[in-house]
Interface confidence: medium
């Protein structure tokens, strides 16, 4: 009976032990596709995350030649009405000009002396630019980048003056420190007697007969408003 | 003596951001603009962004633009350059450089700091 | 954007030759250009600004040319300390552009 009951329990043992090999491989075959499902699933995941970054930089992009697009068609509407009417009164910008704040800017991209970037402004019904807020000195700024760049400022025939008009002494003003200083150590002969934003935006005098950049602006008539979409 | 030191090298995953910093001295940190520009491994130098920390008013290269942010903590003389969603070809010597200017001529950078390795790999 | 073609690409040369490299650019850009030199595993070293003016503590071998849209850097007679890597840059407005460089080699 003894022997018996040993026999009954190798078999048992034989019986679990091929239960718990049985159990593990169908454990590890579980994990395995587990594995695999999870692998399948971040894959999946990053490919979703992917196109759907990819939409959304083409919704932007498409959104903002939507906006190109009825801003240009706005323009040339508005060109069209001028050309119709009378032209006495500038009810919007000029192609290829930026409207901000009911005036009109363009943005040169090449170098002339001071006297003929006021000159060209003048020939385009403009004037060199007159800034009169530090809000208006931000949009120039944004617009021209860190180079020297002419505005509508200049001691030519004594004090101060802008092209306008607008009166300098009550005026915004931002100069970089020590500035304006006329100075006359270039060897270029006599002082400096032309404004200028300088990389940082500053302000500085220097000698008119330098090349730099320009910005014309231009006043939209008070009364207009923005004409309707065709 | 005009100084930028840079931070030290680093090793990042792909999709990740870098910060590399420049400490400047010597010198009015506010009075001069900061640029950066990198080089690939044999590659040239290329232009990426250019802060002016009196004002924060910053520059980007077209190229970089909403991957890399230039910032500048006056209290420490010190400028960054972050650049996100880091992949292979971001690999290279990140430069910091002081722009230096005289009225009525152009612009320079004058001086530079030693460089920062960035290493992009899986 | 600005193009910048600098040429040569490489020169090789001996010590005391006249050594030139030109920087053509896509617009005028007066004279907003500058070089630099570079040695392996180091930053670049202002040479030249406002395109023809001597950076500080550079030797007088070195000088600059030009003005538009073309540049050049001469090495009057080079030295051994010359054989290094050369860039031109301009500032002519964002991006302040590289030439692509010029590699100065011992002949």
């Known amino acids: 009976q003894n022997s018996q009951l040993q026999e009954e329990l190798r078999g048992l043992r034989e019986t679990f032990s091929n239960f718990t090999a049985s159990t593990e491989a169908q454990v590890k075959g579980l994990s395995t596709q587990g594995g695999n499902v999870g692998r399948k699933m971040k894959s999946l995941e990053s490919q979703l995350e992917k196109q759907q970054k990819d939409l959304s930089e083409d919704h932007s992009s498409l959104l903002l030649h939507v906006k190109q697009f009825v801003s240009d068609l706005r323009s040339l509407s508005c060109q069209m009405a001028a050309l119709q009417g009378n032209g006495s009164e500038r009810t919007c910008c000029p192609v290829n000009w930026v409207e901000h704040e009911r005036s009109c800017y363009w943005f040169s991209r090449s170098g002339k002396a001071w006297a003929d970037a006021d000159n060209y402004c003048r020939l385009e019904d403009a004037h060199l630019v007159v800034v009169t807020s530090w809000e208006e000195q931000k949009f120039v700024q944004h617009h021209i980048g860190p180079v020297n760049t002419w505005m509508g400022l200049h001691d030519q025939n004594g004090p101060w003056k802008w092209v306008d008009g607008t009166d300098y002494e009550t005026g915004f003003k931002n100069w970089r420190p020590e500035q304006p200083d006329d100075w006359y150590g270039h060897g270029l002969g006599g002082g400096e007697d032309c404004a200028h934003f300088t990389d940082d935006g500053r302000w500085n005098d220097d000698v008119c007969q330098r090349p730099y950049r320009w910005v014309c602006e231009t006043e939209l008539d008070k009364a207009s408003q923005e004409p309707p979409l065709l | 003596e005009v100084q930028l030191v840079q931070s030290g090298a680093e090793v990042k995953k792909p999709g990740s951001s870098v910060k590399v910093s420049c400490k400047a001295s010597g010198y009015t940190f506010t009075a001069y603009g900061i640029n950066w520009v990198r080089q690939a491994p044999g590659q040239g130098l290329e232009w990426m962004g250019e802060?002016?920390?009196?004002?924060?008013?910053?520059f980007y290269a077209q190229k970089f633009q909403g991957r890399v942010t230039i910032t500048a903590d006056k209290s420490t003389s010190t400028a960054y350059m972050e650049l996100s969603s880091l992949r292979s070809e971001d690999t290279a010597v990140y430069y910091c450089?002081?722009?230096?200017?005289?009225?009525?001529?152009?612009?320079?950078?004058?001086?530079w700091g030693q460089g920062t390795t960035v290493t992009v790999s899986s | 954007d600005i193009q910048m073609t600098q040429s040569p690409s490489s020169l090789s040369a001996s010590v005391g030759d006249r050594v030139t490299i030109t920087c053509r650019i896509s617009e005028n850009i007066y004279s907003n250009l500058a070089w630099y030199q570079q040695k392996p595993g180091k930053a670049p070293k202002l040479l030249i600004y406002a395109a023809i003016n001597l950076a500080e503590g550079v030797p007088s071998r070195f000088s600059g040319s030009g003005s538009g849209t073309d540049f050049t850097l001469t090495i009057s007679s080079l030295q051994p300390e010359d054989f290094a890597t050369y860039y031109c840059q301009h500032f002519w407005g964002t991006p302040f552009t590289f030439g692509q460089g010029t590699k100065l080699e011992i002949k």
């Open positions: 802060i002016f920390p009196r004002s924060d008013a910053t």
């Open positions: 450089a002081r722009k230096g200017r005289e009225y009525g001529t152009s612009h320079y950078f004058d001086y």
